[in-house]
């Protein structure tokens, strides 16, 4: 080795006059944030303001009605899922502002970014439960008259939350903080290291259980419901149905970019140009998915205005009107069989 020519090496664009500034990124990108990150910050800010206030209002309106109205139970649980996710936003916002530096520690890294996935699974499972409820109301009104009660609704919600927690565990477990040497930065992310297969498995499970399977089943479910509703020439308000369809549609629209980039990244080589491009878009995709956490209150208000003709009532009473509409099949089981039969015709419109 002594024969190796150890002269001062030529590093190409090496300039001995440069002084090493700790704040200068090594890839010579400036300290200004990238456009996708700026867009993500704007979305996060709007989602936080609308999401916290809107969902808090929804929780307040539905909490009082949840004892007697099943629809209120559904919307209450959806709002709680969204509200919880919004609480992580100030931390995620701060991290992006600091060029994805994560000074909040390992526990926060595992929990906070996982909240949006918990929200995804909780939301889709709750939406599936709500959709099953709408389906039964239309196709099994007598069963609903006998068994559809607040207790069963709460049990269904508890099962949805439990499954959501279970499905979030893999992402939670693989989240780690990594302290990069230069530029000095602590990053929060998932690290599967030796296990590319497991990374793909998690991404596929997330895509299938959190997106494709619900998309297929809910599309079929609402196709049947809407066909029945239209064929029966609905005689009463389809308010709740329209709201639920809007909520379900928004779920799939806003989760699409996250799911597509997620599955692509799991199959790409981490040092490939496409992977690095998708990684730069990651914050934007997450922020786009986060719109789900504030869109529901907006849908409720828009729906309320539509149903009221114009905004005549106060916001709480408008929301109450949309979210706590009692289904035709009441929780009281004192109706006669003939009453239920005559009601069955009208129930198709729910």
């Amino acid at each position: 080795m002594d024969s190796f020519n150890y002269t001062t090496p030529d590093y190409g664009h090496y300039d001995d006059k440069d002084t090493l500034d700790l704040n200068t990124p090594v890839d010579k990108t400036s300290n200004t944030l990238r456009v996708p990150d700026i867009l993500a910050l704007v979305i996060f800010a709007v989602v936080f303001l609308v999401g916290v206030l809107g969902n808090a209002l929804v929780v307040w309106v539905t909490a009082f009605e949840a004892k007697r109205t099943i629809n209120a139970i559904w919307f209450l649980n959806l709002a709680v899922a969204d509200f919880l996710s919004c609480l992580a936003l100030p931390i995620l916002f701060t991290s992006i502002v600091q060029h994805h530096h994560w000074p909040f520690g390992g526990a926060a890294c595992s929990i906070l970014p996982s909240l949006i996935l918990l929200n995804m699974y909780a939301s889709i499972l709750l939406l599936a439960t709500i959709s099953a409820d709408r389906f039964l109301l239309v196709f099994k009104p007598i069963w609903c008259q006998n068994f559809r009660g607040a207790g069963l609704a709460w049990i269904a919600c508890a099962v949805a939350w439990g499954l959501a927690l279970l499905l979030t565990i893999p992402s939670f477990l693989y989240r780690v903080v990594r302290e990069e040497y230069f530029p000095p930065k602590v990053l929060c992310g998932v690290d599967y290291s030796h296990d590319k297969r497991r990374e793909r498995a998690v991404a596929i499970v997330r895509l299938v259980l959190g997106f494709l399977w619900p998309l297929l089943t809910l599309t079929i479910c609402y196709t049947f419901i809407l066909l029945r509703t239209w064929s029966r020439r609905a005689t009463r308000s389809t308010k709740t149905l329209k709201v639920v369809v809007a909520v379900v549609a928004s779920f799939f629209i806003f989760w699409l970019p996250y799911q597509v980039t997620g599955i692509m990244m799991s199959f790409l080589e981490p040092s490939s140009p496409t992977f690095l491009l998708l990684k730069k878009l990651d914050s934007l995709c997450v922020s786009f998915a986060y719109i789900n956490c504030c869109i529901n209150p907006i849908i409720y208000v828009v729906a309320g205005q539509g149903f009221q003709g114009r905004l005549r009532k106060s916001l709480p009473s408008l929301l109450r009107n949309v979210l706590t509409e009692e289904s035709v099949v009441r929780e009281s089981k004192s109706f006669t069989r003939s009453t239920v039969d005559t009601m069955a015709q009208k129930t198709q419109a729910v």
Partner: antibody, heavy 125, light 112 residues
Amino acid sequence: QVQLQQSRAALAKPGASVKLSCKASGYTFTNHWMHWVKQRPGQGLEWIGYINPINGFNRYNQNFKDRATLTTDKASSTAFIHLNGLTYEDFAVYYCARVPLSYGGSYGPYFFDFWGQGTILTVSS
Amino acid sequence: DVVMTQSPLSLPVSLGDHASISCRSSQSLIHSNGNNYLHWYLQKPGQSPKLLIYTVSNRFSGVPDRFSGSGSGTDFTLKISRVEAEDLGVYFCSQSTLVPLTFGSGTKLEVK
């Protein structure tokens, strides 16, 4: 010609402290971070930390945080490592090593392009 | 800390032979900028380590082209196409993606 000149040997008693030096020549001292690496006899290499001579900014391996202090003297282009509370575990060769300075994807201060010849620290009562 | 595992620990070769040393990290070494900051050093008896390869596959100034490096993520390899007498010594891999910087335990290249 880049050179990092270290004193050949140092001797200290357990519990005492020692200051090892590394004199740089052949380049602008303040333009390059200086790292320190420990190698126990017949063992692998262990990173201690680095110092940026231009502003005194330093960063340590947690294993050495309480017992190693890195300093520089710009006037004499010399880097120092001060080790306190010495134990027999500190008996090792201590290297200073320079990192290159360049703003490019593969470059930056990521690898040690020049090393000192090492100082053997003997801890003996 | 990132643990760097080298294999084999000892590699007996005949001069002119090919040699291959493997280095595996306990965590991915892919930096947020896409680079793998994995380097190879050679230390001869009584000398300080000398840089051979930096950032996986870049030969340092004055290093012969018989040395080549490859790999990404957690698995890396140093290859010597035709071993010469001056190549004998202990080879260390090192990562500088994450803090603390860490080194492999070394692979001793020796004559059979």
